[in-house]
């Protein structure tokens, strides 16, 4: 632990002015693991003037950083690049004349305290005023800056010509597109100071290329993947003062695929579990031993979870018998195509031949988490009746 500091497994605090520290505290290689440090408290360190780019990067778990009543004059732009957990920064009563929003733009700070610094009135610190105005909390800080006449003026009154928030405007066609097709988005940005423009495509899977020239830009997305349905694409304008974004949601239409279909499992009901992907929502149809399966309150499709264009559900069977053993085929269909998969189901042996049920499925009714109503397609057809499951419904449940 550096001289003038104390260290624990999760904290470093340096408050002794003598001899004091001249650089940001660093831990010895074989001491505490810097990743476990969550709080650094520095006070009364008049000779600490700079935070360099690599000073803080080892403290990846850092949540609270306090440097008060010290000599801090300069913070490198990328000083906090690796500190994504930072939530509270307190730089009260230092010697900061300027501070860029670039230091903090990637952080989700709940507190940034900058009181008592000799800021110079310029467009560089206008973002702090904007931040203060956006925070409608009553505990706004009393911040000042020095103007050309060396007069202290409240930041709340600061007016700088040609220094405002930018704007972004995304011109998008109807963003419903078929899988495999391509699309181009256009965006224009405006503002003074002139903003930079960039695209935020999140975790877009599809191949994309962007072209930007000053205040105009385009994004070309090619061979669009079904995995990108529901994703948001944003055009962002950013300058010294702040940023603005305009966003659109991508909808991708694609043929269904049955990504999962397995043999029955038993809980509160027997369930043949499946997962189907498709957009628009596929219609589902079950076949039993090659014939259309007529659903009833004893055999029916239930969707448990819908996640974007993915549907997780069950063909639910109440008290099936040997009469329900056989091949079950699921067909999923929409206007872009269809998919089918088949499984063999064995619920119990024929009476007198194979007495026991499958030992993996004990012969009891298990409590389950319930089922949601089926919201995919119409699966009822009255032809080719197949054996219903036990219509006496021994458990007396309502359906």
């Amino acid at each position: 632990c550096p001289t003038s500091c104390k260290c624990s497994a999760s904290r470093i605090w340096c408050s002794d002015p003598s001899p004091g520290i001249v650089a940001f505290p660093r831990l010895e290689p074989n001491s505490v693991d810097p990743e476990n440090i969550t709080e650094i408290f520095i006070a009364n360190q008049k000779r600490l003037e700079i935070i360099n780019e690599d000073d803080v990067e080892a403290y990846v778990g850092l949540r609270n950083l306090t440097i008060v009543d010290s000599g801090l004059k300069f913070v490198a732009h990328k000083a906090f690049l690796k500190n994504s957990n930072l939530q509270h920064i307190n730089f009260t009563r230092n010697k900061l004349t300027s501070l860029s929003r670039k230091h903090f733009r990637h952080l989700d700070l709940s507190e940034l305290i900058l009181v008592g610094n000799p800021f110079t009135c310029s467009c560089d610190i206008m973002w702090i005023k904007t931040l203060q105005e956006a925070k409608s909390s009553p505990d706004t800080q009393d911040l000042y800056c020095l103007n050309e006449s060396s007069k202290n003026i409240p930041l709340a009154n600061l007016q700088i010509p040609n220094c405002g928030l930018p704007s972004a405007n995304l011109a998008a066609p109807n963003l419903t597109v078929e899988e495999g097709k391509s699309i181009t988005l256009s965006c224009s940005v405006a503002g003074d100071p002139v903003p930079n423009m960039y695209w935020d495509v999140g975790n877009l899977v599809s191949k994309h290329m962007n072209e930007t020239s000053h205040t105009q830009g385009s994004l070309r997305i090619t061979n669009i993947s079904s995995d990108d349905s529901g994703k948001q694409i944003s055009c962002v304008a950013e300058n010294l003062v702040g940023e603005d974004q305009d966003s659109v949601n991508l909808t991708v239409h694609f043929a269904p695929t049955i990504t999962f279909l397995e043999s029955p499992t038993s809980d509160h009901h027997w369930c043949i579990p499946f997962t189907v992907k498709g957009n628009p929502k596929p219609a589902l149809q079950w076949f039993y031993n090659g014939a259309i399966l007529n659903e009833s309150k004893y055999i029916c499709t239930k969707i448990h979870v819908t996640n974007h264009t993915e549907y997780h559900g069950c063909l639910q069977l109440d008290n099936p018998t040997h009469m329900n053993n056989g091949d079950y085929t699921l067909i999923a269909k929409n206007e872009y195509g269809k998919d089918e998969k088949q499984i063999s189901a064995h619920f119990m042996g024929w009476p007198g031949i194979d007495d026991g049920a499958n030992p993996n499925y004990p012969d009891v009714i298990y409590e389950d988490y319930g089922t949601a109503a089926n919201d995919i397609g119409d699966t009822t057809n009255r032809s080719n009746e197949i054996p219903s499951t036990d219509v006496t419904d021994k458990t007396g449940r309502e359906h």
Epitope: F260, V305, T306, H312, V364
Partner: antibody
């Protein structure tokens, strides 16, 4: 009846190791995703990680993945949590919980064990 | 990681009243959210999954709503046994995360 019974908890020294077990019965264990969740005394729930039905995919909460290992033995219907390099903040009640039979890990937990207490103290 | 912010941390109410608990996700999670009840000294019990679907055997006075980033959980006509702790949990992506919990206390 679906039953999950954890065991193996107890007092362990800081820096030490411990292996927890969860014995499952009343359902086809080999079909389900399984998770471990812990709860420090008087605190909230924290998901530790999950394992898929055949044990080929294991997901952990990032801060714990270097010290905890989840495994399963489908022949014994048992889920395991190997804990190493434990610290006082690992003191908690450790639950195993049953996930889903779907092909993806839709992890809501319909069934929980009663928990086993791990106390880390010198 | 997706942060789940649950509020309030504690709430007092009287028998027969209604209460609402809110859960905010730090990013959109669709409807992949569950609610649990935990009684002192007991394991959590699933009440609601997929944001709105009541788990089997759960009384209809419990109700879940919401999608995207904002979710609500309402208990109507509070009974004595409802004055315990409640947690939300996202199962949109790993690591699955829980809200900090809400303790319901009797007025």
């Amino acid at each position: 009846e679906v039953k999950l019974v954890e065991s193996g908890g107890g007092l362990v020294q800081p820096g030490g190791s411990l292996k927890l077990s969860c014995a499952a019965s009343g359902f086809d264990f080999s079909r389900y995703w399984m998770s471990w969740v812990r709860q420090a005394p008087g605190k909230g729930l924290e998901w530790i990680g999950e394992i898929n039905p055949d044990g080929s995919t294991i997901n952990y909460t990032p801060s714990l993945k270097d010290k905890f290992i989840i495994s399963r033995d489908n022949a014994k219907n048992t889920l395991y949590l190997q804990m190493s390099k434990v610290r006082s903040e690992d003191t908690a009640l450790y639950y195993c919980a049953r996930g889903n039979y779907y092909g993806s890990s839709l992890a809501w937990f319909a069934y929980w064990g009663q928990g086993t207490l791990v106390t880390v103290s010198a | 990681d997706i942060q789940m912010t649950q509020s309030p941390a504690s709430q007092s109410a009287s028998l027969g009243e209604s209460v609402t608990i809110t859960c905010l996700a730090s990013q959109t999670i669709g409807t992949l959210l569950a609610w649990y009840q935990q009684k002192p000294g007991k394991s959590p019990q699933l009440l609601i999954y997929a944001a709105t679907t009541l788990a089997d055997g759960v009384p209809s006075r419990f109700r879940g709503s919401g999608s995207g980033t904002k979710f609500s959980f309402k208990i109507s006509s509070l009974q004595a046994e409802d004055f315990v702790s409640y947690y939300c949990q996202q199962f949109y992506s790993t690591p699955y995360t829980f809200g900090g919990g809400t303790k319901l206390e009797i007025k």
